[in-house]
Interface confidence: medium
């Protein structure tokens, strides 16, 4: 089977060859500007910092929504752009960054229903069932929409943020979407340092509780790219 | 609280089969992922199977891959994994574990023993 | 067949700090910044100790840390407790076939 790490609305709606064509299981995801694709078992990421163009929010950054870079400008032509902080002017929830939503044209700062999740409404499951079809191909799995009376604790499946109690996010976490907790400080946190390499992650994080942002960590200065981490630290 | 009770292990033939069941309470058993990890005798933890929570999704170790099947029985809480094709090296405790944010609560495990 | 290194024995006294490491590859355990640690006593189930690197379940005593760095991950026990005495595994995700690794397992003896 195709052992991809692709995931959600941030491959769902690409044409071939970034969404992967259907009739090729072996093709990986070409040379998109972080993009993860598989070589081997390495998930390797191409650096090219390059605008990243967009069809949606989803496929940019969790720092980033997808939009005209101009204003009034050719709407075919949108690439990602860095997120509203608050009491900036926007139009919509996505323009604003984690931890905010738009009301009133303005970003203001979100309860837990108002969470902006990286994938809200379908998962793409592209490991394959191992009891799936006789092709091998990666799947689609879409959660059961049931209602949830109760919120969702920890580890408890959920499609969206307002699915889970208070404190609790809704993030992907290797094979489905489960509420995970926000994060308190010194908690490692992902940056996405390359645009939209964020749809492509099996694991996502909350993001970092108020008056906390994600930095690298001191001490991590030295270290390679690939394996630096990142912790909630004070503003 | 949280609890899980495994039942179903004992001694078998190699090639016999052996149905393996937990039981779970204390918490919305249809709401979480589940998984099997297996321990041999004197050795480390092995990841077995894991099924998601409404049983669309199942995963298996390379080891099992062809021999056991995970499933679940939502209004019975309950958790099963149907070992077949048995050999010596599947002779482990067999724990259940609920794969929340990683496997957050185990149960005691039953021991399976493959022998002739 | 263990995807992840870890070493065979620690030990340390009363009161003192220890760190088990944990080995893996840019596959597993360098490739996600997802570590979880656990307990377990002689007969007893393992317990969740550390998830997310560092991140610790309600419960879990605040002398249990964890961290990472590249392809190698540390748990640190500190002030030492003659309960502490256990095996300890650490687990991670890979991109291969075999989706859920564990290391072999750190015996932690208390003198």
């Known amino acids: 089977t195709l052992n991809s790490v692709l995931n959600s609305n941030a491959i769902k709606n690409l044409p071939p060859p970034l969404g992967g064509a259907a009739g090729h299981p072996g093709s990986a995801v070409s040379a998109a500007p972080g993009i993860l694709y598989p070589g081997g078992n390495k998930y390797q990421t191409i650096d090219n910092y390059q605008p990243y163009p967009c069809a949606e929010d989803e496929e940019c950054g969790t720092d980033e929504y997808c939009a005209s870079p101009t204003r009034g400008g050719d709407a075919g032509v949108q690439i990602c752009l860095a997120c509203r902080k608050r009491r900036k002017r926007c139009m919509r929830h996505a323009m604003c960054c984690p931890g905010n939503y738009c009301k009133n044209g303005i970003c203001v700062s979100s309860d837990q229903n108002h969470f902006r999740g990286e994938i809200e409404e379908t998962i793409t499951e592209s490991f394959g069932n191992d009891h799936s079809t006789l092709d091998g191909y990666s799947r689609r799995t879409t959660l059961s929409s049931k209602m949830y009376h109760t919120k969702g604790q920890e580890g408890s499946v959920c499609l969206r943020s307002s699915d889970c109690a208070s404190g609790l996010c809704c993030a992907r976490h290797f094979w489905s979407k489960i509420c995970k907790p926000v994060l308190k400080e010194g908690q490692v946190c992902t940056k996405h340092r390359r645009k939209g390499s964020h749809g492509l992650e099996i694991f996502q994080r909350c993001y970092c509780g108020e008056g906390l942002s994600c930095r690298i960590q001191k001490d991590h200065h030295q270290a390679s790219n690939s394996s630096r981490l990142h912790t909630c630290q004070r503003h | 609280q949280v609890q899980l009770v495994e039942s179903g292990g004992g001694l078998v033939q190699p090639g016999g089969s052996l149905r393996l069941s937990c039981a779970a309470s204390?918490?919305?058993?249809?709401?979480?992922?589940m998984s099997w990890v297996r321990q041999a005798p004197g050795k480390g933890l092995e990841w077995v199977s894991v099924?998601?929570?409404?049983?669309?999704?199942?995963y298996y170790a390379d080891s099992v891959k062809g021999r056991f099947t995970i499933s679940r029985d939502n209004s019975k809480n309950t958790l099963y994994l149907q070992m077949n094709s048995l050999r010596a090296e599947d002779t482990a405790v067999y724990y259940c574990?609920?794969?929340?944010?990683?496997?957050?609560?185990w149960g005691q495990g039953t021991l399976v023993t493959v022998s002739s | 067949d263990i995807a992840l290194t870890q070493p065979a024995s620690v030990s340390g006294s009363p009161g003192q700090s220890i760190t088990i490491s944990c080995t893996g590859t840019?596959?597993?355990?360098?490739?996600?910044?997802?570590v979880s640690w656990y307990q377990q006593h002689p007969g007893k189930a393992p317990k969740l100790m550390i998830y997310?690197?560092?991140n610790r379940p309600s419960g879990v005593s605040n002398r249990f840390s964890g961290s990472k760095s590249g392809n190698t991950a540390s748990l640190t026990i500190s002030g030492l407790q003659a309960e502490d005495e256990a095996d300890y595994y650490c687990?991670?995700?890979?991109?291969?076939?075999?989706?859920?690794?564990f290391g072999g397992g750190t015996k932690l003896t208390v003198l």
């Open positions: 574990a609920r794969h929340g944010i990683d496997f957050d609560h």
């Open positions: 840019s596959s597993d355990l360098g490739g996600y910044n997802y």
């Open positions: 204390g918490f919305t058993f249809s709401s979480y992922w």
């Open positions: 099924i998601s929570s409404d049983s669309s999704s199942t």
């Open positions: 997310d690197v560092n």
């Open positions: 687990q991670s995700y890979a991109s291969g076939n075999t989706k859920v690794v």
